[in-house]
Interface confidence: low
């Protein structure tokens, strides 16, 4: 049992067969020591009394909130969640699984330049009773701080017949230093809270690896005399790092024809512009890409050839 | 070029050999997010390469006070990571391909460390981990893990000369 | 008394699907994962896949390439294995076992024949 | 996946004698948290598995103490110390470490 904050515990549990479970004793915050008696949640029944309190927690029914109390009045709580460890696995029941990149991915995060900044999502079918807390740091045997602000539902998708929930959370490092080669991952921490079940979420990367550039901006064509060729021309987005010859872009141009068959062509280029040829009824997108490290590319910033 | 006393680098020529070095270290080892390296327990084997950390000088601000810092770390790395790829963990079993980019790549290292420091002036350089992997999986990983090391490296590398070529080139 | 009651035996021909239920009476049953596992004539036993009938996540034995599907009645207090596209290997005592593999169903058999 | 690979296939044994079933598993099952994720199971014939020893070690409720279950991460033993005429069965070993759960090919007690 771990104290999770001020009068919340954690009970590790093996979920198992005849599992004896765990042992716990509570203890009345109070100078009394005579006259105590302690309750579970909202029933009135009477599980013991005395200062200590001794419990077996097995289940879900053993968790909740214990209530000590003397003549009527409350002298404290103490709320009881599980962690369940089943067949040998810490329960992920909470979030959904995003698969992307890769299998068992709870927690995915981008960052759309080298401040420091970055934002975290999850998702869960859950619409209720529903807590979540973000810890981070640079590094974890000698960690160095990183602050991250409330969770805060940003989406709900419907998906067949469920319901999808989208939670974000953004963070940002103390002491960022955005021209520095990183040595040490970030490591992100969600402890999640649904009803009396505890889980937690871990993810570790570098801000190198989630940078996700903002769409190119202010994209425009100018039409070359006498030719079907146009100029394109963008601006690195407003998001990006400074100085741009620094942190610079490369970029990839497409041409698309309406129909999403029709063949694409496609330019790359470190500047930002370039001449292409505009097809009737196509449309002109970029986008951007770190140029020298292979993070993700930007969306398209997208416009229409007439 | 760097010479002693300081003077600038051919900072055109730097900028043109990093952003190849970049190209190369992606086509080296492409298949980064395939592999969480991080979980292969690699304390022991990449710890020990030089970084380019925050006092080294080589942020916009740092590099129009005095690039020598800078340009210093970069050479140490670049040394240091062209040892590497010259060692038993790229040479030994299991063979790389005969097209590999590998080879380029080592040798394109060594040509901007060369760009860096001419015959005759001698910077500190960094002593190369003695890391021989016993089993031709472990060097397997071990190569994947320098390579990932390597890209982050020259990704600042080139962002340096790429600035100095925009800003600090006479 | 906690109890799992499995669903009767069943003659499919190759290429149908089966879908067996475990009816579960005794206990919580979204507190407690529902495992699936069969066994062929005279072979050892072959784990199939699992679910946690509280949120409806499963995680399944690659070996059936997504041919098995597990799902719950939550209301029925019930789990539902679904295999497809059967075979004659497929022929086998199917059984459900609550989380710990401490309850186990009385097994379901199903003959794959033409 | 893990392997489990169970040892004899079949064992005669005479009542009141000990009796011991090996198991060896291809990846270590014992976890950080110090416990060692493996079943033991008896199977009757006619019957669904029923399981005799949970985490290694552990007697599950109504097992007689004539079982007991050791080992280290890899190699496993259920051994019976005394054995009566309703312990004959097929025994499995099961690892629950990680998925997918496997299942030992099972050992085949009989009476001499």
């Known amino acids: 049992i771990w104290e999770l904050k001020k009068d919340v515990y954690v009970v590790e549990l093996d979920w198992y067969p005849d599992a004896p479970g765990e042992m716990v004793v509570l203890t009345c915050d109070t100078p009394e020591e005579d006259g105590i008696t302690w309750t579970l949640d909202q029933s009135s029944e009477v599980l013991g009394s005395g200062k200590t309190l001794t419990i077996q927690v097995k289940e879900f029914g053993d968790a909740g909130q214990y209530t000590c109390h003397k003549g009527g009045e409350v002298l404290s709580h103490s709320l009881l969640l599980l962690h369940k460890k089943e067949d040998g696995i810490w329960s992920t029941d909470i979030l959904k699984d995003q698969k992307e990149p890769k299998n068992k991915t709870f927690l995915r995060c981008e960052a759309k330049n080298y401040s420091g900044r970055f934002t975290c999502w999850w998702l869960t079918t859950i619409s209720t009773d529903l807590t979540f807390s973000v810890k981070s740091s640079r590094g974890s045997s000698d960690p160095q701080g990183v602050t991250c602000g409330a969770a805060t539902l940003s989406a709900e998708r419907v998906r067949g017949d469920n319901k999808e929930y989208e939670y974000s959370v953004e963070c940002q490092e103390d002491s960022a230093c955005p021209a520095a080669e990183e040595s040490l991952p970030i490591e992100v921490m969600v402890d999640a809270v649904h009803k009396l079940k505890y889980e937690n979420y871990t993810s570790s990367f570098f801000i190198r690896d989630i940078i996700k550039p903002d769409p190119p901006k202010n994209l425009q064509l100018k039409p070359l005399k006498n030719s079907r060729q146009v100029e394109v021309s963008w601006e690195y987005p407003d998001t990006w790092s400074t100085p741009h010859s620094y942190f610079s872009l490369t970029f990839c141009v497409q041409v698309q024809g309406k129909s999403k068959r029709e063949k694409k062509d496609r330019v790359f280029t470190d500047k930002t512009s370039a001449t292409v040829i505009c097809r009737k009824n196509a449309s002109i997108s970029v986008r951007a890409q770190d140029r020298y490290y292979s993070s993700s590319w930007s969306e398209w910033a997208s416009v229409p050839c007439s | 070029r760097a010479v002693p006393g300081g003077s600038s680098p051919a900072w055109t020529q730097c900028q043109q050999l990093s952003q190849k070095l970049c190209t190369l270290a992606w086509s080296a080892h492409p298949l980064v997010g395939h592999m969480d390296l991080r979980e292969e327990g690699d304390e022991e084997t990449t710890n020990d390469v030089p970084h380019i950390q925050c006092g080294d000088g080589c942020d916009p601000q740092g590099l129009r006070d005095n690039s020598q810092f800078c340009l210093q770390r970069i050479h140490q790395g670049l040394i240091f990571y062209e040892k590497l790829l010259g060692s038993d963990i790229f040479t030994g079993e299991p063979s790389l391909l005969p097209d590999s980019p590998v080879g380029q790549l080592h040798a394109s290292l060594l040509g901007l460390s060369q760009l860096l420091q001419p015959e005759g002036h001698h910077w500190e350089t960094q002593q190369i981990p003695s890391l021989s992997p016993s089993q031709p999986w472990q060097r397997l990983l071990l190569r994947f893990k320098i390579l990932r090391s390597l890209q982050a490296f020259v990704a600042v590398a080139a962002r340096v000369f790429a600035h100095g070529a925009a800003t600090l080139s006479p | 008394e906690f109890q799992l009651v499995q669903s009767g035996a069943e003659v499919k021909k190759p290429g149908a699907s089966v879908k067996v239920s475990c009816k579960a009476s005794?206990?919580?049953?979204?507190?407690?994962?529902m495992n699936w596992v069969r066994q062929a004539p005279g072979q050892s036993l072959e784990w199939m896949g699992v679910?946690?009938?509280?949120?409806?996540?499963?995680t399944y034995n690659q070996k059936f390439k997504g041919r098995v599907t597990i799902t719950v009645d939550q209301s029925a207090s019930t789990a539902y294995m679904e295999l497809s596209s059967l075979r004659s290997e497929d022929t086998a005592v199917y059984y459900c076992a609550r989380r710990g593999f401490a309850y186990w169903g009385q097994g379901t058999l199903v003959t794959v024949s033409s | 996946d893990i392997v489990m690979t169970q040892t004899p296939l079949s064992l005669p044994v005479t009542p009141g004698e000990p009796a011991s079933i090996s198991c060896r598993s291809s990846?270590?099952?014992?976890?950080?948290?110090?416990?060692?994720?493996l079943n033991w199971f008896l199977q009757k014939p006619g019957q669904s598995p029923q399981l005799l020893i949970y985490l290694m070690q552990t007697r599950a409720s109504g097992v007689p103490d004539r079982f007991s279950g050791s080992g280290s991460g890899t190699d496993l033993t259920l051994k019976i110390s005394r054995v009566e005429a309703e312990d004959v069965g097929v025994y499995y070993c099961?690892?629950?470490?990680?998925?997918?759960?496997?299942f030992g090919s099972g050992t085949k007690l009989e009476i001499k």
């Open positions: 990846k270590s099952l014992l976890y950080k948290d110090g416990k060692t994720y």
């Open positions: 099961q690892q629950i470490a990680e998925y997918p759960f496997t």
């Open positions: 005794g206990y919580s049953f979204t507190d407690h994962n």
């Open positions: 679910i946690n009938p509280n949120y409806g996540t499963t």
